[in-house]
Interface confidence: low
């Protein structure tokens, strides 16, 4: 029951729904990423904070990363339930005192997102949405530029290699 050499309990990272997702999809996805645990046997379930009901969720395969494992689970919540606190409950034999690890997902303020655009209060939400879209655009633009750079580098390298080969052949003759 005790791991002497290292802490191999699941290490959680949480991902909250984006404003864009909640605005466009009328729902939000909570994602719970669990890393660096051993052994691979792990149980994950989701509940609302003040309820014992287990909610329907999905999970990825348990993946080996070096000497430990990782897994992720996600819960899609309808817009009406986004204002409730949710819990990702993780059961693993190396949770340090053997008790279930409870990862709290804070409520999402959907009222800020769904306000009338004419309302001044919604300006921040719209700005945030715009910022998110801008960031996403910037991200893809960056990837595109990176891809172009790789292609240019490949072409130049190829040209240089051919030129070198040509020069060398010239010297030999």
């Amino acid at each position: 029951d005790k791991q002497l050499d290292a802490d191999v309990s699941p290490k959680p990272t949480i991902f909250l729904p984006s404003i864009a997702e909640t605005k466009l999809q009328k729902a939000g996805t909570y994602l719970c990423l669990l890393e660096k645990f051993f052994p691979d046997v792990i149980k994950i379930h989701w509940q609302e904070k003040k309820s014992n009901t287990i909610l329907g969720s999905q999970e990825g395969n348990t993946m080996k990363t070096n000497d430990t494992y990782m897994k992720f689970s996600w819960l899609t919540v309808p817009e009406k339930s986004l204002d409730k606190e949710h819990r990702c409950i993780v059961r693993h034999e190396n949770n340090k005192n053997g008790v279930d690890q409870e990862i709290i997902f804070p409520p999402i303020k959907t009222d800020v997102i769904t306000m009338d655009p004419k309302d001044n209060c919604s300006k921040d939400a719209n700005d945030t949405l715009l910022l998110q879209l801008t960031n996403t655009s910037a991200y893809y633009m960056y990837l595109l530029l990176l891809l172009k750079s790789v292609v240019y580098f490949a072409i130049i390298t190829c040209c240089l290699l051919r030129r070198t080969a040509f020069c060398c052949n010239g010297e030999k003759s």
Epitope: D1, K2, Q3, L4, N52, K96, G98, V99, D100, Q101
Partner: antibody, heavy 118, light 107 residues
Framework: QVQLQQSGPELVKPGASVKISCKIS????????MNWVKQRPGQGLEWIGR????????KYNGEFKAKATLTADKSARTAYMQLNNLTSVDSAVYFC????????????WGQGTLVTVS | DIQMTQSPASLSASVGETVTITCRAS??????LSWYQQKQGKSPQLLVY???TLAEGVPSRFSGSGYGTQFSLKINSLQPVDFGNYYC?????????FGGGTKLEIK
């Protein structure tokens, strides 16, 4: 406020068995480990074992494996500990206690049940 | 099993004094240590968990510190209600053993 209510004192004869109970006041009974702790008169605390009422999973301190049996009734929100083949060294106060947090200790304790073997 | 050694076994102090109780683990337990107070005939009460986090409702004159194998519980400005027995307990794996206890008495 969560409360753990334990059964009353027991006076038992050597060689007999006793079953003590611990009822919890809140709905999360199934989702928390219920622990049992022994305290002999004027002595320190010893962890006996724990049960996860949700699926009946149990873990025991090696020293108590042959002595204690932990069970739980989810519908009654009650945990039980049966002590077998009692001798004078089993005379003690037995506490139930609940682990509430991943990084914490025993947050809630029962008031204790005195078992006297005589 | 991990052994928890608590010292001193008993301690006399006056109201208003500051006292420190120490606890040593036989191996590295990181921060997985709790402190409890127990009054005569009562059940233990959680004071500190995860080495230095005060449990709900515990006065700020109590503080926990330490990491790995060496831990301490400090009580500033002792109050009459603080007298009783104190126990440390590790919860790094099983079994979660307790220290032998420290009896804090009024001088």
């Amino acid at each position: 406020q969560v409360q753990l209510q334990q059964s009353g004192p027991e006076l038992v004869k050597p060689g007999a068995s006793v079953k003590i109970s611990c009822k919890i006041s809140d709905y999360t009974f199934s989702n928390s480990w219920m622990n049992w702790v022994k305290q002999r008169p004027g002595q320190g605390l010893e962890w006996i074992g724990r049960i996860y009422p949700g699926d009946g999973d149990t873990k025991y301190n090696g020293e108590f494996k042959a002595k204690a049996t932990l069970t739980a009734d989810k519908s009654a929100r009650t945990a039980y500990m049966q002590l077998n083949n009692l001798t004078s060294v089993d005379s003690a106060v037995y506490f139930c206690a609940r682990w509430e947090r991943y990084d914490g200790g025993f947050t809630y304790w029962g008031q204790g049940t005195l078992v006297t073997v005589s | 099993d991990i052994q928890m050694t608590q010292s001193p076994a008993s301690l006399s102090a006056s109201v208003g004094e500051t006292v420190t109780i120490t606890c040593r683990a036989s191996e590295n337990i990181y921060s997985y240590l709790s402190w409890y107070q127990q009054k005569q005939g009562k059940s233990p009460q959680l004071l500190v968990y995860y080495a230095n986090t005060l449990a709900e409702g515990v006065p700020s004159r109590f503080s926990g510190s330490g990491y790995g194998t060496q831990f301490s519980l400090k009580i500033n400005s002792l109050q009459p209600v603080d007298f009783g027995n104190y126990y440390c307990q590790h919860h790094y794996g099983l079994p979660p053993t307790f220290g032998g206890g420290t009896k804090l008495e009024i001088k």
